[in-house]
Structure formats: C-alpha cells, structure tokens
C-alpha cells in the first residue's frame, strides 16, 4: 500500500506518457489522477511501467470502479490484465471477442493462468455458448483449451464451431470429451465426401460407434494405426478381421507391432484364430479352432 | 525464472567513459522489459535508462550521456556512459521483468566509481 501524500509541485500528471516511468510510487498515487488513468488506458501499455508501477495504477482503477471495470478500461489493460486477480475479473462483463483477444495476447506462449481461465469462463459464459468466432480465438492463442472443458461443457459447443478445431487441439482429450464432440463433428462434416470427410473427422474417431467404424471399414480409408489405437475398445472389439483389415489399409500390418496393447490385445482375443492368421501377421491369441463363442452380453439382454 | 549478471563497473576519471553489461539468462524469451537503475550511498534506487521494444527511455540526469542497447543474439543489455561526472557515482543494477509471470528479476550491482 502506497502512503497518501502530496504530489511534488510540478510533477501533477497532465496526461499518460512516458515520463511517468521515472516516478516513484508515491508520486504515481499522489499525481495521477484515476479519472485521467481510465480515459487514456489505450496509452499504458505503450508505456515500460514496472510491475510495481502498474500495481499503484491498479490500485487506482480498483478505487474508481469499485463494481468491476468497464470494457472501455478492460479492452485497454494491456500488461496491466496480469497484476488482475480472479476475484477483480469475476466483477467484469466482457462482451467484445476484441477485448477478449486483446487480453489473451498479453499472455500469449505461455500457460493459461488462473486469470486467463476465468476471463474466458466469463466471456464464455455471457455468450451461452461456444460460438464458431470464440472457439477459433481460444484454440488459437491455447492449442489445449477444448480439452480442458468437462463433457457438460462441450455440450454447449454449436456443431458449427467444430470447424474451427484442428487436430492438434484434441490431443490431451479423453475419451469422455470425444463420446461429446464426435457426434457434433458428424453433423459438422455431413455433406463432405468421402475422403474429405474422412480427413476432417479422424481426429474425433475417438468417440466413434462401431456401426460408423464398420461404415468407414467400406470406404477405403486407410486409417493409421495412431488413429486406431486411440478408437474406444468397446467400439472396436465387434469389428471383424475383414473390416479391420479394410479400414487399416495398409497401415494393418502395424497390429503386430501393437498386439500387446489395448484396443488390440482385446480385440485379439475376441477374434477366431483361424480369422487373424489371414493377416499372415502371426497375431496370437485369438479363439482357437473349435472353440464356441457366446456373447453373454446378449444373453443377458435377452433375460 | 531470469538470472542477470552485470559486469564492466569500475573506478574512471570524470569525463571518462565506461561501457557495463548485463548478460540474461534462463526464460529469456519471456523478457518484456529491461532497465538500469543506479543507487548512491544512503539514497533511494533511481531508474536511469529503459528499453522496451525498439524504444529508449532515459533520465533527465542522464540524457544525451547514457545509451542503453541491447544485443538479443547474445542476451546482452548494455549501458554505455559518456562524460561521466563524480554525481555517477553508484551500484549500477540491472533489471528485467518478464510476460506470463508478471515478475521483476535483477542482478547483483556493479559498482562505478568516478574520481575528480
């Protein structure tokens, strides 16, 4: 806290500039007026305060909007936005995708922050929803942002805005945020053909039924084992050899390579023996010959 | 986290030149702005020169006398004095804050001492 006390003769701030920087803290309190501050935000960030600086500036615009900020000031924080705490960005109300971007690139390359996550909770929040225009500047400026959203959350997510997502910002998603996207992304990309369509849906294949993996298995697509390894194993353990070898292509000569590792080793085991030795992969572990196969899932629903 | 180390003070006559150094270490990338300030014994620290970007700032004390630069290859700043009076007499620190962390990092001090 700055103690109160007179401004030097001589030194009352006329207006934000660069002389400014020379001043000790106590003449920032004394001789600027906050008044002055918020009609010449635009020009702080032009100006090398100190962290410390800014502090006093903060403490300013906190006693002259004791509400929260108004846009007007908040489009304009500049590097002031990182002195912000999380309670001081709960009392904003940010409605410019301008603003927003604005304060996203203070912090641009570096790890979303406390006060990062809540200004786009905020902005996001008095949208309603994930609109095409946020989504693209989120996932700009934070690769991982969509993985970062509950499955409740990106429900709101609009079909459309899946446009804006490219492959690298599903990297850290579970498989819990794919079972969410993936029937979005299906609608998104519907009237695509094939190829196309396969190339804008492979990232969220995650979160794919077996019927639409058995669709794909016809459609020569090629997947890479990458891709297949990340499917849900309750998705993949109903694919017959023939379809998987169809959908791989010839990336299915990567099973052998995978054989241990789930959805493979399960689906492996699922598989008659005879089936997988077609492959001529020497994949191990299948039902041997003569062996009876019952589906006690099935029997169960028919209980 | 930034280390800063200077270098380059020493004793000079009065109108004599010395040029002192910073060199920059760590998170480098994230430096958003650098400074000297020079402290006088029993006084406050003084900011003397900034740079921020492409633009200089300096004291009135020091105007026209003092150039700051900095060479981003080598993470080097500099601070070259010219017509150095015995008033220049101080620790000379060097300081960098930093874009994500919101931080203030600074060096060790170099002494300048300049005789009449």
């Known amino acids: 806290e700055v103690e109160k006390t007179a401004c030097p003769s001589g030194k009352k701030a006329r207006e934000i500039d660069e002389s400014l920087i020379f001043y000790k803290k106590w003449e920032l309190e004394a001789c600027v007026d906050a008044a002055l501050l918020a009609t010449q935000m635009d020009r702080v960030n032009a100006i090398p305060f100190t962290y410390e600086q800014l502090d006093v500036l903060k403490h300013k615009l906190d006693e002259l909007y004791p509400q929260g900020y108004p846009e007007s000031v908040i489009q304009h924080l500049g590097y002031l936005f990182l002195k912000m705490s999380p309670e001081d960005i709960r009392k904003w109300n940010v409605t410019s995708l301008e603003t927003l971007k604005a304060l996203l690139e203070v912090n641009k390359g570096h790890e979303m922050s406390p006060q990062v996550a809540t200004l786009i909770d905020r902005f996001v929040k008095g949208r309603g929803q994930l609109d095409k225009d946020t989504l693209d500047t989120l996932t700009a400026f934070y690769p991982g942002y969509l993985c970062s959203l509950s499955p409740e959350e990106l429900s709101s997510v609009p079909p459309s805005s899946i446009w804006a997502v490219r492959p690298q910002d599903l990297d850290t998603c579970d498989p819990r945020q794919l079972d969410v996207l993936y029937p979005k992304a299906r609608l998104a990309f519907q009237n695509m053909n094939g190829s196309e369509y396969f190339v804008k849906i492979q990232s969220f294949l995650g979160g794919a039924p077996t019927e639409d993996l058995k669709a794909l298995s016809q459609q020569n697509v090629s997947m890479d084992l990458a891709t297949f390894m990340k499917l849900r194993t309750d998705a993949v353990l109903p694919l017959t050899v023939a379809e998987v070898q169809k959908l791989l292509g010839p990336h299915v000569e990567g099973l052998k390579a995978e054989e241990r590792h789930r959805p493979v080793r399960d689906w492996i085991l699922r598989q008659r023996q005879d089936d997988l030795d077609t492959l001529g992969l020497g994949l191990q572990g299948g039902i041997p010959n003569g062996y009876l196969v019952l589906d006690l899932s099935m029997q169960e629903a028919l209980s | 986290q930034v280390q800063l180390v200077e270098s380059g003070g020493g004793v000079v006559q009065a109108g004599g030149s010395l040029t002192l150094s910073c060199a920059a270490s760590g998170s480098t990338f994230s430096i958003r702005a650098m400074r000297w300030y020079r402290q006088a014994p029993g006084t406050e620290r003084d900011l003397v020169a900034v740079i921020y970007g492409s633009s200089t700032y300096y004291a009135d004390a020091v105007k026209g006398r003092f150039t700051i630069s900095r060479d981003n290859s080598k993470n080097t700043l500099y601070l070259q004095m010219n017509s150095l009076r015995a008033e220049d007499t101080a620790v000379y620190y060097c300081?960098?804050?930093?874009?994500?962390?919101?931080?203030?990092?600074w060096g060790q001090g170099t002494l300048v001492t300049v005789s009449s």
């Open positions: 300081n960098a804050d930093t874009i994500g962390t919101a931080r203030d990092y």
